[in-house]
Interface confidence: low
């Protein structure tokens, strides 16, 4: 685990213990696409309520209606899925209640018995046209990273064709995935080219690879499953954020760190700095400067905005998030280009969240 020496910023306020936080797994509200959804903010004495979705302020629009303690979503779409929160602000404190919205077809909420979606993927080939395996519906395979709340059902699909009809097998973290590898086992729906795991738990996290093969060839596709524990746990940071960025001298740039934490999270943006020409102190620890941290005087701590950057601003920016149980951190690099060079966004490097196990 990285050791952080906050020698450069001694004015950092000590983190206050959270007054209240949600320990339970938030309720999951499931809606089919097109349906309307109404959720009541389950907070007492909620005089002034603000709403967020995935950490971003949620305001009313043509499909979202906010009336008192109720949130209404009309004509829900999969884009409405996410982690929602309502915050009741009072004179002495504030309290937040979290809930998940899952706009999807029935299978992802656990009912897979009447799954007709995918029957068309089981393609029968003319027996004379020998063909190596191929994907028949890559659209259903685009979402590689699946972040799923614990206790939910997960379905991975690899719709394929070929002649003779290929077989499908599944690997977890590159090794044969056996029923005894998880409590409750899993289901394979060969006709739908799918793997289904019910009631996922943290030990289900990992890479799942479908291998589809016949005598003429083999293809594979890998999904990454992250099980989001909605209970007091170390913070979880969305993979790939903050993302590497580049800008010209004088330009502006934003780093975003998306945090999932039930216990009150404390967010810090930290940068390696030099002191007397050295990056490291006499104790061998790096000099670090806290650029921004969550607290009373800080606006959205998940976003670090840098304005009118200079070459000195180039380097690694660390988003460090801690709660009373643990911490996590991820970093991104800022490249500052000379003015004559056109700015371009660097290729984003997706890193697995640092769970600091």
């Amino acid at each position: 685990r990285p050791s952080f020496s906050l020698v450069e910023d001694t004015t950092l306020e000590p983190e206050e213990p959270p007054t209240k936080y949600q320990i339970s797994q938030p309720e999951v509200y499931v809606a089919a696409p097109g349906e309307s959804l109404e959720v009541r903010c389950l907070l007492k004495d909620a005089a002034v309520i603000s709403w967020t979705k995935d950490g971003v302020h949620l305001g009313p629009n043509n499909r979202t209606v906010l009336i008192g303690e109720y949130l209404q979503i009309k004509g829900a779409t999969p884009r409405d899925s996410g982690l929602y929160a309502c915050t009741a602000s009072r004179t002495v404190d504030s309290e937040t209640w979290y809930f998940m919205v899952n706009v999807t077809d029935a299978i992802s909420s656990g009912d897979d018995e009447d799954d007709t979606d995918g029957a068309e993927d089981f393609v029968s080939e003319n027996s004379n046209n020998k063909r190596a395996p191929y994907w028949t519906n890559t659209e259903k395979m685009e979402k590689r990273l699946h972040a799923v709340p614990a206790a939910n059902t997960v379905k991975f699909r690899c719709p394929a064709g070929g002649n003779p009809m290929p077989t499908m097998r599944w690997l977890k973290n590159g090794k044969e995935f056996k029923q005894e590898h998880r409590i409750g086992g899993y289901k394979v729906r060969n006709q739908h080219w799918s793997l289904i795991m019910e009631s996922v738990v943290p030990s289900d996290k990992g890479n799942y690879t479908c291998v589809v093969e016949n005598e003429y060839g083999s293809i594979n596709h890998t999904y990454h499953l992250d099980v989001v524990e909605r209970s007091p746990h170390r913070p979880i940071l969305q993979a790939g954020l903050p993302a590497n960025a580049s800008t010209v001298v004088g330009g502006d740039v934003e780093f975003v760190c998306k945090v999932y934490s039930d216990a009150q999270p404390h967010i810090q943006w930290i940068k390696h700095v030099e002191k007397n020409g050295s990056k490291y102190g006499p104790d061998g620890l790096p000099y670090l400067k806290v650029l921004k941290h969550s607290g009373i005087n800080s606006s959205n701590a998940e976003v670090l905005a840098l304005f009118n950057v200079t070459e000195a601003d180039a380097g690694e920016y660390i988003c460090k998030v801690s709660n009373y149980i643990g911490q996590a951190n991820q970093s991104a690099w800022l490249t500052v280009l000379p003015k004559q060079q056109a700015p371009g966004r660097e290729k984003e490097i997706t890193a697995s969240p640092d769970y600091l196990e």
Epitope: R1, S24, Y324
Partner: antibody, heavy 117, light 110 residues
Framework: EVQLLESGGGLVQPGGSLRLSCAAS????????IHWVRQAPGKGLEWVAV????????YYADSVKGRFTISRDNSKNTLYLQMNSLRAEDTAMYYC??????????WGQGTLVTVSS | QSVLTQPPSASGTPGQRVTISCSGS????????VNWYQQLPGTAPKLLIY???QRPSGVPDRFSGSKSGTSASLAISGLRSEDEADYYC???????????FGGGTKLTVL
Amino acid sequence: EVQLLESGGGLVQPGGSLRLSCAASGFTFSNYGIHWVRQAPGKGLEWVAVISYDGSNKYYADSVKGRFTISRDNSKNTLYLQMNSLRAEDTAMYYCARDSSSAEDYWGQGTLVTVSS
Amino acid sequence: QSVLTQPPSASGTPGQRVTISCSGSSSNTGSNTVNWYQQLPGTAPKLLIYRNNQRPSGVPDRFSGSKSGTSASLAISGLRSEDEADYYCETWDSNTRGVVFGGGTKLTVL
């Protein structure tokens, strides 16, 4: 293998002090909150205190607030419970337990504290 | 007096199904997940059920948990003599900001 081993219990007079230790092994101690839970002879479990992974947050049961102090030394993989102004009703088996995913998933075998004159 | 209310005792014969209840309030069981612990005579407690209904690895599927509103319950099916123990429910209390336990239920296998 996750292991928690309590020590430091014994006989002490009312008003006296005692310091309990909990030595942890088999996991990354500095990543986990740890609880103290006690059980009086023939009685049920009573939560005493919890400390966060880095020691920055501490919570106590009302019955021990102001008398007991929970602390940890991550470099030694050790948890402590400093007990002052002990009373007869503090007599109990004291367990340390690891906090994980909203439950205490691993417990030590306990150390017995007897407060008597 | 425990914050969570459990029956002091329960009993059943081998093979039977037994249910142990746990009742709390909106600030504890009503808004937080419930855990269950088994304490065999002379031993430390052992986590049996966490987050209302999840079993840690190694716990037989004869043990199951559920929660509705401010009440939770532990069910043990196919009762065995080795299930004779004390069972405790536990959760977090958002008002006191601490862990709270039930008074415990002594299960006797007749």
